[in-house]
C-alpha cells in the first residue's frame, strides 16, 4: 500500500536456497610432492564442479612449504572457467620443510578477510592437501583450536605417496592430518595412497563440501 | 589484562624434583588460544625453552630434558605445573612462566631455584 | 634443533644512535615464526617482535625488524635511554623452540 492508501503491485525477492561458501584450499607445494601436475589435476576436477561466482561460491588458494603464497584470493575471479585457468597455472613452490600450522594458519588471518574477498555470513570451508609430518606440528593445537573459533570447517587430505615410495610407517602421518579435519572426523578427513589417486575423491570431496550448503 | 605468577621452593635438594606452579589470573587457562610454557634463565645465561601445555593437555617438550619433565594443567584452578626431576647443580636458575600465541606475549616475573644440598 | 647466533655480542653505543642487531640461524626460519625480545637486569623478557617485523602492542616504531630465510635484524632507529638491554631473537616454528645467545646494548 502507497502512502496515499492506493493498492501498488509489489513483489518480494525470490527465495532461494544458500549456494554460498567461501573455500580456501591449502595446498602443501614442498619438494616431497611429486607430481605436481596430479595436483593441478585434482583442483581442475574439484573446482570444474564448482559455481564459482560473486554470489555463489568463491575460492581462494594458498600454497606453503617452508613459506606461504596467496596463489589467489577469493575475489579474484569471478567464474568457474576463470579459476580454472589460474588453477592450471599454479607452480610448485618447492620448500624443504612442510610448514602445515603456517599454512592453515595464514589462511585462517589473511585469506578469510573481507579484503580478500571473504563475505561475513557466508560458510568458510578450509581445504587443506599435504604429504607430510609437518615441521611445526607442535603448533598445530593453537591453529586448529582458531579456526574453530572462526567456525572454519576443515577437510584434511593426507597423500600417503612419499610415505609409501620410502616404505615407511604412515601411522604419526595419518593422526595428524586426522587431527586437522572438523568433527566428525570421517566424514571430514581423505587419505590417498598417492599423488596420482587424488582425483579419486573428487565426487565424494565434492558431495561433502556441498553437502554444508544445506 | 592477563598476568602471571610463578611459586614453588627456592631451594632444592640434587637428585630431588623441582616443582613450581604459574597461576594465571586476568584471563582463563582454558581459552584455547595459546600455549603455556616455561623457560628458564642460567645465572647471567640466556634463555632455554622447557616446553609448554595446552588446555587440552597436549605437552611439547625440549628434547634436552625431556626425560626429565612433566608439564600439566589444572584448567579449575588456571594452573600450570612443572615437574623437573633428578635436579642437579646445572639446574640452577630463574625460572619463568609464560604465554604463547604469535612469540610469549606475557611472562610471568621469574623465580630462582638454587639446587644445592 | 635450529641454533640461533647473534652478533655483535655486545653493542657500545650513544644515546640517539642507531642500533642494528644481527641474528643468523643454521637452518632456514620462516619469518611468521621469528620473535624478538628485549629483557632488562632483573626482569622477565618482553616481546618486541613478533612475524619478525610486526611490533607487539605498545612497542614503540623506533623497533623494526627485517629479514627471511637465515638472516634477521632488529634495528632500533634512535637509541633512548631505556633500551640499554638484551635482545634475544627466538624461533618457534621448529621444536625445540630456541633462543638466539643474545645481544647485550649497552651505553658507550
Known amino acids: 500500500v502507497s502512502p496515499t492508501f492506493q493498492v501498488v503491485n509489489s513483489f518480494a525477492p525470490v527465495q532461494e536456497c544458500s549456494t554460498q561458501l567461501d573455500i580456501v584450499i591449502v595446498l602443501d607445494g614442498s619438494n616431497s610432492i611429486y607430481p605436481w601436475d596430479s595436483v593441478t589435476a585434482f583442483l581442475n576436477d574439484l573446482l570444474e564442479r564448482m559455481d564459482i561466482g560473486p554470489k555463489q561460491t568463491q575460492v581462494g588458494i594458498v600454497q606453503y612449504g617452508e613459506n606461504v603464497t596467496h596463489e589467489f584470493n577469493l575475489n579474484k575471479y569471478s567464474s568457474t572457467e576463470e579459476v580454472l585457468v589460474a588453477a592450471k597455472k599454479i607452480v610448485q613452490r618447492g620448500g624443504r620443510q612442510t610448514m602445515t600450522a603456517l599454512g592453515i594458519d595464514t589462511a585462517r588471518k589473511e585469506a578469510f578477510t573481507e579484503a580478500r574477498g571473504a563475505r561475513r555470513g557466508v560458510k568458510k570451508v578450509m581445504v587443506i592437501v599435504t604429504d607430510g609430518e609437518s615441521h611445526d606440528n607442535h603448533r598445530l593445537k593453537k591453529v586448529i583450536q582458531d579456526c574453530e573459533d572462526e567456525n572454519i570447517q576443515r577437510f584434511s587430505i593426507a597423500i600417503l605417496g612419499s610415505y609409501n615410495r620410502g616404505n615407511l610407517s604412515t601411522e604419526k602421518f595419518v593422526e595428524e592430518i586426522k587431527s586437522i579435519a572438523s568433527e566428525p572426523t570421517e566424514k571430514h578427513f581423505f587419505n590417498v595412497s598417492d599423488e596420482l589417486a587424488l582425483v579419486t575423491i573428487v565426487k565424494t570431496l565434492g558431495e561433502r563440501i556441498f553437502a554444508l550448503e544445506a | 589484562q592477563v598476568q602471571l605468577q610463578e611459586s614453588g621452593p627456592g631451594l632444592v635438594k640434587p637428585s630431588q624434583t623441582l616443582s613450581l606452579t604459574c597461576t594465571v589470573s586476568?584471563?582463563?587457562?582454558?581459552?584455547?588460544?595459546?600455549?603455556w610454557s616455561w623457560i628458564r634463565q642460567h645465572p647471567g645465561k640466556g634463555l632455554e625453552w622447557i616446553g609448554y601445555i595446552f588446555y587440552s593437555g597436549s605437552t611439547y617438550y625440549n628434547p634436552s630434558l625431556k626425560s626429565r619433565v612433566t608439564i600439566s594443567v589444572d584448567t579449575s584452578k588456571n594452573q600450570f605445573s612443572l615437574k623437573l626431576s633428578s635436579v642437579t647443580a646445572a639446574d640452577t636458575a630463574v625460572y619463568y612462566c609464560?604465554?604463547?600465541?604469535?612469540?610469549?606475549?606475557?611472562w610471568g616475573q621469574g623465580t630462582t631455584v638454587t639446587v644445592s644440598s | 634443533e635450529i641454533v640461533l647466533t647473534q652478533s655483535p655480542g655486545t653493542l657500545s653505543l650513544s644515546p640517539g644512535e642507531r642500533a642494528t642487531l644481527s641474528c643468523r640461524a643454521s637452518q632456514s626460519v620462516s619469518s611468521s615464526y621469528l620473535v624478538w625480545y628485549q629483557q632488562k637486569p632483573g626482569q622477565a623478557p618482553r616481546l618486541l617482535l613478533y612475524?619478525?617485523?610486526s611490533r607487539a602492542t605498545g612497542i614503540p616504531d623506533r623497533f623494526s625488524g627485517s629479514g627471511s630465510g637465515t638472516d634477521f635484524t632488529l634495528t632500533i632507529s634512535r637509541l633512548e635511554p631505556e633500551d640499554f638491554a638484551v635482545y634475544y631473537c627466538?624461533?618457534?616454528?621448529?621444536?625445540?623452540?630456541?633462543f638466539g645467545g643474545g645481544t647485550k646494548v649497552e651505553i658507550k
Open positions: 586476568g584471563g582463563s587457562i582454558s581459552r584455547g588460544n595459546y600455549y
Open positions: 612475524d619478525a617485523s
Open positions: 627466538q624461533q618457534y616454528g621448529n621444536s625445540p623452540l630456541t
Open positions: 609464560a604465554r604463547d600465541g604469535y612469540g610469549m606475549d606475557v
